[in-house]
């Protein structure tokens, strides 16, 4: 018996860029990360072994909720900092998958 | 379908505060950014600030500081505009705007609240 | 802060005639506008972002363009809806700024 396997919020730092600016302190957020389950022992349909694979839908650990930040890029030359608005995950999930999301 | 439905007008005197409401559907509200804009009668647009609904961070217009206080209630996905010491000047039509991050900021509008000061 | 300057701020033109209006940056190499369409009574209706991606539902007969700091609204053929007040914004620089606007009739 196979407990469910864990979808997992890593937090990850870094900096945003656009071209040569920078922002001025690094941003957080999630990086979804994991397996969703529960697993079932099947049958390996090409040896006589068994393997560890989930059956029925595909369930991936991937984004459920976003938010926005703003941060001010900071660039060379004496120029304005300027403002931009990012999109962050701020939690996931495990959902079932649909051809709309991205299979990597 | 994102909305976006402003309280009704307002009459107030001057001296007097006056709070509008923003409340914001077929969307999740925390995602995205609320502005609020300022358009006095037959003039140009003032951006007067924003607020993140997910941490409750403000950025205001310098012009604005002081005067305008911008909150949320994130239960009910309602966006607050109050203006305190209202004079004359402040008599205009004030707009809620959902800011797309950097892509359309401002696709989804208000309709608008007219605030009047009037003795 | 960034000044949007614009102009005209009026101007009248006929059905099926190509319209132009500007704004210019007072300030600052990378300026994100938007360009918005007012009609009396109303809310702004966003017209095109990024300085010339046009939003969802826009007719095609509008386009923005940009060169260095100007920034060029085109109607390609006036058509009496689009009778209304223009007004761009830039968004890269705290605080958001809007031009004057320009106020669009039909002769």
């Known amino acids: 018996d196979v407990s469910e396997y864990s979808c997992r919020e890593l937090h990850f730092t870094r900096y945003v860029t656009d071209g040569p600016c920078r922002s001025a302190k690094p941003v957080t957020e999630l990086v979804c990360s994991g397996q969703c389950g529960p697993a079932r022992l099947l049958p390996n349909a090409i040896g006589r072994g068994k393997w560890w694979r989930p059956s029925g839908p595909d369930f991936r650990c991937i984004p459920d909720r976003y938010r926005a930040q703003r941060v001010q890029l900071l660039c060379p030359g004496g120029e304005a900092p300027r403002a931009r608005k990012v999109r962050l995950v701020a939690s996931c999930k495990c959902k079932r998958l649909t051809r709309f999301h991205n299979q990597s | 379908e994102v909305q976006l439905q402003q309280s009704g007008p307002e009459l107030v005197t001057p001296g007097a505060s006056v709070k509008i409401s923003c409340k914001a559907s077929g969307y999740t509200f925390t995602d995205h950014y609320m502005s609020w804009v300022k358009q006095s009668h037959g003039k140009s647009l003032e951006w007067i600030g924003d607020?993140?609904?997910?941490?409750?961070?403000?950025t205001y217009n310098q012009k604005f500081k002081g005067t305008a206080t911008l909150t949320v209630d994130k239960s009910s996905s309602i966006a607050y505009m109050e203006i305190r010491g209202l004079t004359s000047e402040d008599s205009a039509v004030y707009y809620c705007?959902?800011?797309?991050?950097?892509?359309?900021?401002?696709?989804?509008w208000g309709q608008g609240t007219l605030v009047t000061v009037s003795a | 802060d960034v000044q949007m300057i614009q102009s005209p701020s009026s101007l009248s033109a006929s059905l099926g005639d190509i319209v132009t209006m500007t704004c210019q940056a007072s300030q600052g190499t990378s300026i994100n506008l938007n360009w918005f369409q007012q009609k009396p009574g109303k809310a702004p209706k966003l017209l095109i972002y990024?300085?010339?991606n046009l939003e969802d539902g826009v007719p095609s007969r509008f386009s923005g363009s940009r060169y260095g700091t100007d920034f060029t609204l085109t109607i390609s053929s006036l058509e009496d809806e689009d009778l209304a007040t223009y007004f761009c914004l830039q968004h890269s620089y705290l605080p958001y700024t809007f031009g004057g606007g320009t106020k669009l009739e039909i002769k």
């Open positions: 607020i993140n609904p997910y941490s409750g961070e403000t």
């Open positions: 705007a959902r800011d797309d991050y950097d892509a359309s900021p401002f696709a989804y």
């Open positions: 990024g300085s010339s």
